[in-house]
């Protein structure tokens, strides 16, 4: 007796982070024996969509002609073969940008920093938000995000880096997100170029794991995870 059908592969083109109004195609690739493909979206009635396979039957295409908030979320796909339904694919998280106005990204004390010193990237939103993401151009994943606990919303998040090395240099942007959905992000901030001078080499630096602050207009430093409720932003390392 054959074992369970292998799970399909799920991906999005041109990528899984899509600006509002742009088109995106979700692909589900199974096996040549597939007769039907099903796409499920978390917290939506299943199936979210069904498609017949494209020749040679090992994959199906699910098209989103214009990205909106309704399409943002977590997807899984399945295929049906003569022996039944496959295991679910690994999840695909489809994120939409442009849900909110762009935050402001700055570097303290300056975007020009000497190797071995410290710098803090500050992402500020004029309205209260509960998640801030910092990304670096050409990095595979967000460097980190700061998410507020217990729904406490903040106007800013600080991303400290220490000690800085040449690898920290590059172009950064930040995004903010509201509590409605973590799959909806703001427009990206304007880019910030971090320029590192000096020669203290460290091949694999990372942002320092120090206490995060996310003061709003009050400028009250906030405590890390595990402290009093409503006390700030939880740091998620990617």
């Amino acid at each position: 007796q054959a074992g369970p059908l292998p799970k399909p592969t799920l991906w999005a083109e041109p990528g899984s982070v899509i600006s509002w109004g742009n088109s995106v195609t979700i692909w589900c690739q199974g096996t040549l024996e597939a007769r039907e493909y099903r796409l499920d979206k978390e917290e939506s009635p299943a199936p979210w969509d069904r498609q017949n396979p494209l020749e040679p039957k090992n994959k199906a295409r699910f098209s989103i002609p214009s990205m909106t908030e309704d399409y943002a979320g977590r997807y899984r796909c399945y295929y049906r073969s003569p022996v039944g339904w496959s295991q679910p694919s690994d999840p695909l998280e489809l994120v939409m940008t442009g849900a909110y106005s762009k935050p402001t990204l700055s570097a303290l004390p300056s975007p020009l920093v000497t190797s071995g010193k410290s710098v803090t990237l500050l992402c500020q939103s004029r309205s209260p938000m509960d998640t801030f993401l910092l990304i670096k151009e050409r990095a595979a994943h967000p460097l980190l995000h700061l998410r507020s606990e217990h729904g406490a919303q903040q106007h800013q998040a600080e991303f400290p880096m220490s000690p800085v090395t040449s690898v920290h240099g590059g172009t950064y942007r930040c995004f903010s997100s509201h509590g409605f959905s973590h799959y909806l992000l703001s427009h990206p901030s304007d880019p910030l170029e971090l320029i590192v001078s000096g020669s203290l080499e460290d091949p694999r630096p990372s942002p320092t794991r120090s206490v995060s602050t996310a003061a709003g207009p009050e400028d009250q430093p906030l405590m890390p995870t595990g402290s009093v409720p409503h006390s700030g932003l939880r740091r998620h390392w990617e």
Partner: antibody
Framework: EVQLVESGGGLVQPGGSLRLSCAAS?????????ICWVRQAPGKGLEWIGS?????????YYATWAKGRFTISRDNSKNTLYLQMNSLRAEDTAVYYC???????????WGQGTLVTVSS | DIQMTQSPSTLSASVGDRVTITCRAS??????LAWYQQKPGKAPKLLIY???TLASGVPSRFSGSGSGTEFTLTISSLQPDDFATYYC????????????FGGGTKVEIK
Amino acid sequence: EVQLVESGGGLVQPGGSLRLSCAASGFSLSSSYWICWVRQAPGKGLEWIGSIDSGSVGITYYATWAKGRFTISRDNSKNTLYLQMNSLRAEDTAVYYCVRHGDNWALDLWGQGTLVTVSS
Amino acid sequence: DIQMTQSPSTLSASVGDRVTITCRASQSINSWLAWYQQKPGKAPKLLIYKASTLASGVPSRFSGSGSGTEFTLTISSLQPDDFATYYCQHGYIRGDLDNVFGGGTKVEIK
């Protein structure tokens, strides 16, 4: 030319309603700005009414005194912002301005204003 | 709530005078403060943003300073065109605000 043009003002009786419009040109309301309404009663200072985020979700925030009676909305296809005002009172008599929050967090683009008079 | 308090409410001065207007926030607003000039019958005009940055086309006799809760607008040598009302404004947008503007300062001829 980048500008905001308000319309819809006029005379309205106490308890009545009015909808003001603000047409944007030279930039898109769906680009990364907030837009707000500000009013100024005769001989008085500037008073913020509320703001709407131009992001697709369209979050709105209102001054504490404006909640319930004032509603800000937008129609991206017409590149127009609206202010719906209900249960109007004599003290709502003012010039109403449509204003853009710039990248610098300041109010960098103002309409010419439209006068609303609430009187019987 | 963040409240903006401007002083003085009226200021009498002469052409050539150095004029200073103060704006105090009830809690820190970092440097997110702007100053506006308004003349009768006209919409306000942005003078200074981010506490100290001069808006495009604004004469250099205007300057701004401060951060946190205390801010000042200075006109180094008052000109005839400067007699107007001036307002400060903080840049935050929230649901617990009564207003984002200070009460205004009218600069009149002495």
